[in-house]
């Protein structure tokens, strides 16, 4: 491949250049922008992502980056000034310039001899820059998201194209298509590819129809498909649930607001460990399930489910996935049991006029120091399973 001539500011003595073979993607990403197709340019070095040198940033590199990311061509290439008040404001969007009076060394440069990413090379420690960073806004400012699914990793599939968020039609929508969505969003793999009406219908345009991914694509817009012009309505909006999405249920209680806490994560129902199950976690879960607030955290029972999830909340989060959490795949809740909770909306709290001496009760020892009494009703017996 032709190698671009190094500009004056290139520190060739310490530079290690890499040229990208056909079929390899340019190791670049855009950050701090409005979508995955705009923002500050970062290049991947061996173990980290580093901002690309603004001093050596030009329209050819901008075009190549946009194409490499599947974002069309470059609409505007610019430089972002360093956060120091003495420097002049950054050039207006669309301007491309090379900084003078370069003083600092060490930033990687992205050098392109043409607008195709295969004609680019990353040169480490190459740039003596004034601290400005390369920025670009691509013409096809594309982005992807999952909405109305209770988290960033589940919901109706929406693409941003031409400045508008729109749906994807569920015709031919399958797990391979959903895999691409999940991977692109950093949400693991697809657990479900859902047809329309599993989530609330969208309102904007329908951007794609007959999507047919192989599953290997990096971006949904790389998949074969048709423009979603006339043949789909929002009742056919495609949806996806990814492995990193968390959903919760309470099992074995009188109703959905009482019981053992289980989280669906990475394709299976997992226990939540009661060794770190405190009032704040119970409160967040009850509220997120629409079950009011936590009233009781009964001691856990032995269980045989896979998975071992721990949460740490401050009590103000909307869902447990907004809390600090960790998933220990090799340790079944250590020495603890599965967490349980009784929420205020459970019917077991209502119409319970406990007499002075309880009538028919069942007593079960669940720990050396704790006994639980369960009223002898059919609906309660499940709690002991």
């Amino acid at each position: 491949h032709p190698s671009p001539a190094p500009p004056d500011q290139l520190n060739t003595s310490s530079a290690e250049s890499e040229l990208w073979e056909p079929g390899e993607r340019l190791p670049v990403r855009l950050t701090n922008g409005s979508s995955s197709c705009s923002g500050t340019v970062e290049v991947r070095l061996e173990a980290s992502w580093e901002p690309a040198c603004g001093a050596l940033w030009d329209s050819r590199a901008a075009e190549a980056v946009c194409r490499a990311l599947g974002c069309g061509g470059a609409e505007a290439a610019s430089q972002l000034a360093p956060p120091t008040p003495e420097l002049p404001p950054p050039p207006a969007a669309g301007n491309t310039s090379v900084a003078a009076n370069a003083t600092l060394a060490g930033a990687p440069a992205l050098l392109c001899s043409g607008a195709e990413w295969r004609l680019c090379e990353v040169v480490e420690h190459a740039c003596r820059s004034d601290g400005r960073r390369a920025r670009v806004t691509c013409a096809e400012n594309r982005a992807l998201r999952l909405v109305d699914g209770g988290g960033a990793c589940a919901g109706r599939v929406e693409m941003l194209e031409h400045g508008e968020w729109g749906s994807v039609c569920d015709d031919t929508w399958d797990l391979e298509d959903a895999h691409v969505v999940c991977r692109q969003l950093g949400c693991g793999w697809a657990v479900q590819a859902l047809p329309g009406l599993h989530f609330t219908p969208g309102r904007g345009p329908i951007h794609r129809d007959q999507v047919n991914c192989s599953g290997a694509e990096a971006y949904l817009w790389d998949c074969p498909g048709l423009p979603g012009q006339h043949y789909c309505g929002h009742k056919e909006d495609a949806g996806a649930v990814c492995s990193e999405h968390q959903s919760w249920r309470l099992t074995g209680g009188a109703d959905r607001c009482e019981g053992q806490v289980e989280v669906h994560f990475r394709g299976v129902w997992n226990t939540v460990c009661d060794s770190e199950w405190y009032p704040s976690e119970a409160k967040v879960l009850c509220q997120s399930l629409g079950c009011g607030t936590a009233v009781e955290r009964p001691k856990g029972l032995p269980h045989s489910l896979s998975g071992r999830m721990y949460y740490s909340c401050n009590g103000e989060e909307l869902t447990l996935s907004n809390c600090s959490w960790r998933f220990n795949n090799s340790n079944l809740c250590s020495q603890s049991l599965a967490a349980r909770v009784l929420c205020s909306a459970s019917r077991s709290l209502h119409n319970l006029s406990t007499p002075e001496v309880p009538a028919s009760v069942q007593t079960v020892t669940i720990e050396s120091s704790v006994t639980v009494k369960i009223e002898n009703k059919e609906s309660r017996e499940l709690m002991l399973l």
């Epitope: 060794s275 770190e276 405190y278 009032p279 409160k283 607030t293 009233v295 009781e296 955290r297 009964p298 001691k299 740490s312 009590g315 009784l342 077991s348 709290l349 209502h350 319970l352 406990t354 309880p358 120091s369 704790v370 006994t371 639980v372 009494k373 369960i374 009223e375 309660r380």
Partner: antibody, heavy 119, light 107 residues
Framework: EVQLVESGGGLVKPGGSLKLSCAAS????????MSWVRQAPGKGLEWVAT????????YYPDSVKGRFTISRDNVKNTLYLQMSSLRSEDTAMYYC????????????WGQGTLVTVSS | DIQMTQSPSSLSASVGDRVTITCKAS??????LTWYQQKPGKAPKTLIY???SLADGVPSRFSGSGSGQDYSLTISSLESDDTATYYC?????????FGSGTKMEIK
């Protein structure tokens, strides 16, 4: 104002029984879990029993399990502790305590009723 | 069960002194710790809840700190009215457990 008034304490022989009551007022009794905590003369505090707001869940430490029974009547706004097979080491001041709704600590206490187990 | 180790068991200090009582849990209790003051012949009174929150009506000379396993109650300027026994309680996990108490005397 939250008020918890214990009654029913007294002198009882070893092996005997006694029933304590705690009358609650000034708050919605049926919404709160309630507990009994005791304190032997010159000793520290020891949790004895807890009952959830609706009475579905009951907790005891090993030291009283099988001998003490906690119950409540949400209509009468009263908490009970039925004590049987009493031992000399059960001699203590017994306090009724309300459990905080959000954080679970004992936020209100009664003045206590003294139980003396002696022959 | 979580064990609470409270120290010292007794303390003698002068009016105006700054005093600190500590409680150590046998494992992390995530700030679910309450401090109580009990005067002779009286019921316990809540001073500090959730490790650092001052209960209603409690003078600001009382403060709580700590996290994880280690917690402390500090009286910034001791007053004669502070003669009492102080207890910690962990309420993160059932069974709830108290510290053994610290008897505070004024010199």
């Amino acid at each position: 104002e939250v008020q918890l008034v214990e009654s029913g304490g007294g002198l009882v022989k070893p092996g005997g029984s006694l029933k304590l009551s705690c009358a609650a007022s000034g708050f919605k009794f049926s919404r709160y879990a309630m507990s009994w905590v005791r304190q032997a003369p010159g000793k520290g505090l020891e949790w004895v029993a807890t009952i959830s707001s609706g009475g579905s869940y009951i907790y005891y430490p090993d030291s009283v399990k099988g001998r003490f029974t906690i119950s409540r009547d949400n209509v009468k706004n009263t908490l009970y502790l039925q004590m049987s097979s009493l031992r000399s080491e059960d001699t203590a001041m017994y306090y009724c305590a309300r459990r905080d709704y959000d954080l679970d600590y004992f936020d209100s206490w009664g003045q206590g009723t003294l139980v003396t187990v002696s022959s | 069960d979580i064990q609470m180790t409270q120290s010292p068991s007794s303390l003698s200090a002068s009016v105006g002194d700054r005093v600190t009582i500590t409680c150590k849990a046998s494992r992390d209790i995530r700030s679910y710790l309450t401090w109580y003051q009990q005067k002779p012949g009286k019921a316990p009174k809540t001073l500090i809840y959730y490790a650092t929150s001052l209960a209603d009506g409690v003078p600001s000379r009382f403060s709580g700190s700590g996290s994880g396993q280690d917690y402390s109650l500090t009286i910034s300027s001791l007053e004669s009215d502070d003669t009492a026994t102080y207890y910690c309680l962990q309420h993160g996990e059932s069974p709830f457990t108290f510290g053994s108490g610290t008897k505070m005397e004024i010199k």
